[in-house]
Interface confidence: medium
Amino acid sequence: ASVVTELRCQCLQTLQGIHLKNIQSVNVRSPGPHCAQTEVIATLKNGKKACLNPASPMVQKIIEKILNKGSTN
């Protein structure tokens, strides 16, 4: 299906969750002129990108764990 990119959002679809062991890093983009929604973009250990649903409880736990891990290093 064709997807028209409205605004400049990078997440056109989102995953509800992903295994933490597959994630290298997570970038949380706040809403702005470029995009009206919060975007959670995970960089996977295989180098690929995946957009995660910021409203998903599983994703929120992943973000919390990764941020906590980063602050303890």
Epitope: R8, N27, K48, K49, C51
Partner: antibody, heavy 125, light 107 residues
Framework: EVQLLESGGGLVQPGGSLRLSCAAS????????MSWVRQAPGKGLEWVSA????????YYADSVKGRFTISRDNSKNTLYLQMNSLRAEDTAVYYC??????????????????WGQGTPVTVSS | DIQMTQSPSSLSASVGDRVTITCRAS??????LHWYQQKPGKAPKLLIY???NLESGVPSRFSGSGSGTDFTLTINSLQPEDFATYYC?????????FGQGTKLEIK
């Protein structure tokens, strides 16, 4: 073959107007954002404006805000840049560029992967 | 606005050399950065997207790396056709901004 062809450039006096066109072919035009980028003589690249696939969202550099208007006609596969109140500092080669780049189903990046050949605009009295 | 600063502004090198160009963003842009090559009188050409991904058809001697604020473009074993001007560009937020360019010249 994916192609972009600009037209409409030329010599115009300060304060004058010009409309640039960019004819697209070889891809589904309405699906992709498009940008205008300019390059003054001997200078670097400067992004001017962008427009979303449907035309519903537009973006401008501060240097052209209020003077330039980007638009598109998806039925004609054409991108436009209406330039009003032109100044000497607007003198440049103007390029249109396609913002392509789907990576995975869940992530999209915006890269100017196809460019036109450029059309020169000279603002001088 | 996000400022992009490239260094060096110009660079002289010989065929076969390994060259590195750096680009620094005024704030973190994740890996939302591209590299373009431009030859005199021609339109720019996309080389690297998202900091480290090689655009289709671009020779493997080109590579990109970096994330956050610091990025590099490396050309291994320079070829005669590589002498050109190189630009980085961020798309993390609008206005989109380019670096000032790095002119790569033959020594």
């Amino acid at each position: 073959e994916v192609q972009l062809l600009e037209s409409g450039g030329g010599l115009v006096q300060p304060g004058g107007s010009l409309r640039l066109s960019c004819a697209a072919s070889g891809f589904t035009f309405s699906e992709l954002s498009m940008s205008w980028v300019r390059q003054a003589p001997g200078k670097g690249l400067e992004w001017v404006s962008a427009i979303s696939g449907s035309g519903g969202s537009t973006y401008y550099a501060d240097s052209v805000k209020g003077r330039f208007t980007i638009s598109r006609d998806n039925s004609k596969n054409t991108l436009y840049l209406q330039m009003n109140s032109l100044r000497a500092e607007d003198t440049a080669v103007y390029y249109c560029a396609r913002e392509g780049g789907r990576l995975e189903p869940y992530y999209y990046y915006y890269a100017m992967d196809v460019w036109g050949q450029g059309t020169p605009v000279t603002v001088s009295s | 606005d996000i400022q992009m600063t490239q260094s060096p502004s110009s660079l002289s090198a010989s065929v076969g050399d390994r060259v590195t160009i750096t680009c620094r963003a005024s704030q973190s842009i994740s890996d939302n950065l591209h590299w373009y090559q431009q030859k005199p009188g021609k339109a720019p050409k996309l080389l690297i997207y998202d900091a480290s991904n090689l655009e289709s058809g671009v020779p493997s001697r080109f590579s990109g790396s970096g994330s956050g604020t610091d990025f590099t473009l490396t050309i291994n074993s320079l070829q005669p056709e590589d002498f050109a001007t190189y630009y980085c560009q961020q798309y993390y937020s609008t206005p989109l901004t380019f670096g000032q360019g790095t002119k790569l010249e033959i020594k």
